[in-house]
């Protein structure tokens, strides 16, 4: 329950966050768990810790193994476990399935590549993007942000891409790759004002304080291959990545589905270890085309317990 | 040493209010949560909520919502309980502990509250 | 919600014996389960946290285990102080104590 994967190439540069969760104020010790000896904090080492975040600086194939970190608050100390794989560099352009995050889709007009687990560094755009490892060029390909856009989209354009970045800290810089496949569906159709389908408009979710919940914001904006269609969710009217709150996250991709030959599209917002302050926000999905913007408001309750004795 | 000081004993009449206090020393109440466990005599132990004292955020348990409220004071390091309309079966040692999100490490010695006509 | 189930109630063992008093929830709460002692007319205790993590200062005849639904506090050899009201509690899902085990003199 509190171990995470996490893998990445040697020479780039890998950062792996705590899978427990605690206040900003609890102090982060890392360990290597089969030694136990202590992870340094000091940013001149190779591999320290910094807080929640573990970074490798570059990575190695030895640093390959299983972390723990251990939060520790005044009164108890949570223990979280990271499990890292660093591999070498493919010779060729192959990129085995081990190193591949989840697979997205798009259509003939929306398509939207994430570059996964980019939010844990620190990054100034552009991105770079590969397809089958040759850059992507032409006026078809637009990195924009953390994603890769591609206009008038063909089934050709399904496979793998990688998205490419440079970390930097303390002002030296250091590569990151990852890479996820594509795949197209392709369809003709018209485009409608958004509807959201999920969720209902001022609609109430009861959580579990201390438990995780997933927010999904579902919309459908036509039938068929949609050249604008966009979900998100927005925090008291603010943006997730304005909001800085690292419990809270936008999953990496939009997953494209098709309902009844409708073309919809959802995001799903997770927040881990539910808090109380998260019952005071208001969350607010999202769905923008070309005909428009809807917004639909759901807040957090808490679920109301029966206990036995 | 953590240590958790209650307030005294307290007699109330049915439908009245008690409110506890919990001071806190060796320990930066901002730091953690303060949760109360209600013991009525020869009884199990029971939660009844917690405070994130920092932001003031509480939760409690079902069967106290709506007459429990419990409160903190960072610049005394001091938590409050404080039960309404109170009746027999409220009689009870209440205790103040602080901890995680999850459980209890430090207690306070206790507070009897006799409710009775 | 979680409803826990705490036997026995009542247990009588002499010194030295091995004791073992389990918790069983009606769902799988990984190891979000902590174990409390209390002697009369005082606070508890921690003994254990997350399952199987003994609070520092408390002997190590005290131990944990178990995952899921069925938990177990083992102490390995009785000892005159540990006579005393057991508690297991539960935070998975909010918070909430079983109903306890006195343990007594044989």
């Known amino acids: 329950k509190f171990s995470k994967q996490s893998w990445g190439l040697e020479n780039e540069a890998l950062i792996v966050r705590c899978p427990r969760q605690g206040k900003s104020s609890y102090i982060v010790d890392w360990y290597y768990s089969q030694t136990n000896k202590s992870i340094p904090t000091q940013e001149r080492n190779r591999v320290f810790a910094s807080g929640q975040l573990l970074k490798f600086l570059p990575a190695e194939v030895a640093d390959s193994g299983i972390y723990t970190c251990i939060v520790r608050s005044p009164t108890f100390n949570r223990t979280g476990y990271a499990n890292v794989t660093i591999y070498k560099k493919q010779p060729d352009c192959n990129v085995p399935d081990y190193l591949m995050y989840s697979t997205v889709s798009g259509s003939e007009k929306n398509s939207k590549i994430y570059c996964p687990t980019i939010d844990l560094y620190n990054w100034t755009a552009p991105l770079e993007w590969f397809k089958n490892c040759q850059a992507l060029q032409g006026s078809r390909y637009k990195a924009h942000k953390s994603f890769l856009v591609i206009d008038n989209v063909m089934t050709d354009d399904a496979g793998d891409y990688t998205c490419k970045f440079i970390h930097n800290e303390n002002g030296a810089n250091y590569s990151v790759t990852a890479t996820r496949s594509f795949t197209v569906k392709d369809e003709q159709g018209f485009s409608l004002f958004p509807v959201i389908r999920a969720p209902a408009h001022n609609e109430t979710k009861e959580v579990e304080i201390g438990e995780n919940t997933n927010l999904t914001c579902s919309a459908c904006f036509g039938k068929g291959a949609q050249f604008l269609a966009t979900v998100q969710w927005q925090l008291n009217g603010n943006k997730i990545t304005d909001f800085s709150e690292p419990r809270i996250q936008q999953e990496e991709g939009q997953n494209q589905s098709f309902s009844n030959g409708l073309a919809c599209v959802n995001t799903v917002l997770r927040i881990a270890d539910v808090k109380e302050e998260d019952l005071l926000l208001r969350y607010d999905c999202l769905a923008l085309n070309l005909h428009g913007l809807r917004r639909h408001t759901i807040r957090l309750s808490r679920k109301h317990h029966h206990h036995h004795h | 040493e953590v240590q958790l000081v209650q307030s005294g004993a307290e007699v109330k009449k049915p439908g009245a209010t008690v409110k506890i206090s919990c001071k806190v020393s060796a320990f930066n109440i901002k730091d953690d949560y303060m949760h109360w466990v209600q013991q009525a005599p020869g009884k199990g132990l029971e939660w009844m909520g917690r405070i994130d004292p920092a932001i003031g955020n509480t939760e409690y348990a079902e069967k106290f919502q709506g007459r429990v409220t419990i409160t903190a004071d960072t610049s005394t390091d001091t938590a409050y309980m404080e039960l309404s309309s109170l009746r027999s079966e409220d009689t009870a040692v209440y205790y103040c502990?602080?901890?995680?999100?999850?459980?209890?490490?430090?207690w306070g010695q206790g507070t009897l509250v006799t409710v009775s006509s | 919600d979680i409803q826990m189930t705490q036997s026995p109630s009542s247990l009588s063992a002499s010194v030295g014996d091995r004791v073992t008093i389990t918790c069983i929830t009606n769902t799988d709460i990984d190891d979000v389960i902590h174990w409390y002692q209390q002697k009369p007319g005082k606070a508890p205790k921690l003994l254990i946290y997350?399952?199987?993590t003994l609070r520092p200062g408390v002997p190590s005849r005290f131990s944990g285990s178990g995952s899921g639904t069925d938990f177990t506090l083992t102490i390995s050899s009785l000892q005159p102080e540990d006579f005393a009201t057991y508690y297991c509690?539960?935070?998975?899902?909010?918070?909430?104590f079983g109903q306890g085990t006195k343990l007594e003199i044989k």
């Open positions: 502990a602080t901890g995680d999100f999850y459980a209890m490490a430090y």
């Open positions: 997350e399952g199987n």
């Open positions: 509690l539960q935070s998975d899902n909010l918070l909430t």
